[in-house]
């Protein structure tokens, strides 16, 4: 089953997706779609990048990270209950059947009555505790694992943002894998 991410109505939702560019600026086309990843494409596309830039996006969907370094995590602004569902992140690596496909489940909860402290960035769930198993057909698509291809600088940034938050323990306990390439 896919990894689940949560956000409250009115918040921004964050769906992580990363890859490691072969060289700085040597980007790979990426698409985000609403719905599970089909066999070749991305479902109902909400955002797309090419080898140079973001070339298609719809309102409320944007990339908050540095996509030129492979951080293609999706931010959905001001979510509503209708934003719940499966999202597809597809990294369209050139070559024969090289695509990386990740299905992520977004669960939107009604807003809490009592205000809660917010982070600099809206992290919508504890980091997942499972690793990626990569496949090619939809039937073989597994789950997005614990922040693949993240580097130490990103971890440091995340830790700073999470300090003094209830998510700090989740980060510590998540078993997040760090790969430096």
């Amino acid at each position: 089953s896919e990894v689940e991410y949560r956000a409250e109505v009115g918040q921004n939702a964050y769906l992580p997706c990363f890859y490691t560019p072969a060289a700085p600026g040597n980007l790979v086309p990426v698409c985000w779609g609403k719905g599970a990843c089909p066999v070749f494409e991305c479902g109902n596309v909400v955002l797309r990048t090419d080898e140079r830039d973001v070339n298609y996006w719809t309102s409320r969907y944007w990339l908050n990270g540095d996509f030129r370094k492979g951080d293609v995590s999706l931010t959905i602004e001001n979510v509503t209950l209708a934003d719940s569902g499966i999202y597809c992140c597809r990294i369209q690596i050139p070559g024969i059947m090289n695509d990386e496909k990740f299905n992520l489940k977004l669960v939107i909860k009604p807003a809490k009555v009592t205000p809660a402290p917010t982070l600099q960035r809206d992290f919508t769930a504890a980091f997942p505790r499972m690793l990626t198993t990569r496949g090619h057909g939809p039937a073989e698509t597994q789950t997005l694992g614990s922040l693949p291809d993240i580097n130490l600088t990103q971890i440091s940034t995340l830790a700073n943002e999470l300090r003094d938050s209830r998510l700090a323990n989740d980060l510590r306990d998540s078993g997040a894998t760090i790969r430096i390439g």
Epitope: P29, C31, G33, A36, F40, Q92, G95, D99, P138
Partner: antibody, heavy 119, light 111 residues
Framework: EVQLVESGGGLVQPGGSLRLSCAAS????????MSWVRQAPGKGLEWVAA???????YFPDSVKGRFTISRDNAKNSCYLQMNSLRAEDTAVYYC?????????????WGQGTLVTVSS | EIVLTQSPATLSVSPGERATLSCRAS??????????MQWYQQKPGQAPRLLIY???NVESGVPARFSGSGSGTDFTLTISSLQSEDFAVYYC?????????FGGGTKVEIK
């Protein structure tokens, strides 16, 4: 109106090569996965290659290593390069547009081009 | 690969009658609640034409007498009242995984 027009078919000897072209019009070509599907005389349909909108390539084992697919979005064209051809590759080759947002099934087809592999 | 078996190979039907075509997959083609099965019609000398996608969705421009049903591994194409232009070969196709595969076809002929 969506149109797909194949060309490049013909007679080729076993072991030879052929390059098929598919000229597309009437839609935003770069947004769609494209496939080639073939049909041997009197037989059923067989999918032989696909290229996604992002340029990823897909083949069945029967042609992997012998066929390659490419696209030129500037020319609204898709190509099938066939090498090391065998008698069993004889077929009508159709260019087909994958359904937008999916790509795994085909909502528009060309009329096909016949490839005959024979000595 | 997913093998699709169509039956019968040939179906003899009179105009106005109902035709029921079957397609069985060697494994499930269910994916997140959707059945990734399609049906095509092909007439002699012509390219195939998409009739049904995702098991039961009728493609735009296809007459309402065509319908699809099924889930998992068993799928059916029904033509409620055969017209003269419906006599053709019908293929099922799965888009669950690579390689994409087609069934062997069912020929619907005039009885």
């Amino acid at each position: 109106e969506v149109q797909l027009v194949e060309s490049g078919g013909g007679l080729v000897q076993p072991g030879g090569s052929l390059r098929l072209s598919c000229a597309a019009s009437g839609f935003t070509f770069s947004r769609y996965a494209m496939s080639w599907v073939r049909q041997a005389p009197g037989k059923g349909l067989e999918w032989v290659a696909a290229i996604s909108s992002g340029g990823s390539l897909y083949f069945p084992d029967s042609v992997k290593g012998r066929f390659t697919i490419s696209r030129d979005n500037a020319k609204n064209s898709c190509y099938l390069q066939m090498n090391s051809l065998r008698a069993e590759d004889t077929a009508v080759y159709y260019c087909a547009r994958g359904r937008e947002a999916d790509g795994g099934y085909f909502d528009y087809w060309g009329q096909g081009t016949l490839v005959t592999v024979s000595s | 690969e997913i093998v699709l078996t169509q039956s019968p190979a040939t179906l003899s039907v009179s105009p106005g009658e109902r035709a029921t075509l079957s397609c069985r997959a060697s494994e499930s083609v269910e994916y997140y609640g959707t059945s990734l099965m399609q049906w095509y019609q092909q007439k002699p000398g012509q390219a195939p034409r998409l009739l049904i996608y995702a098991a039961s969705n009728v493609e735009s421009g296809v007459p309402a007498r065509f319908s699809g049903s099924g889930s998992g591994t068993d799928f059916t194409l029904t033509i409620s009242s055969l017209q003269s232009e419906d006599f053709a070969v019908y293929y099922c196709q799965q888009s669950m995984k690579v390689p994409l595969t087609f069934g062997g076809g069912t020929k619907v002929e005039i009885k």
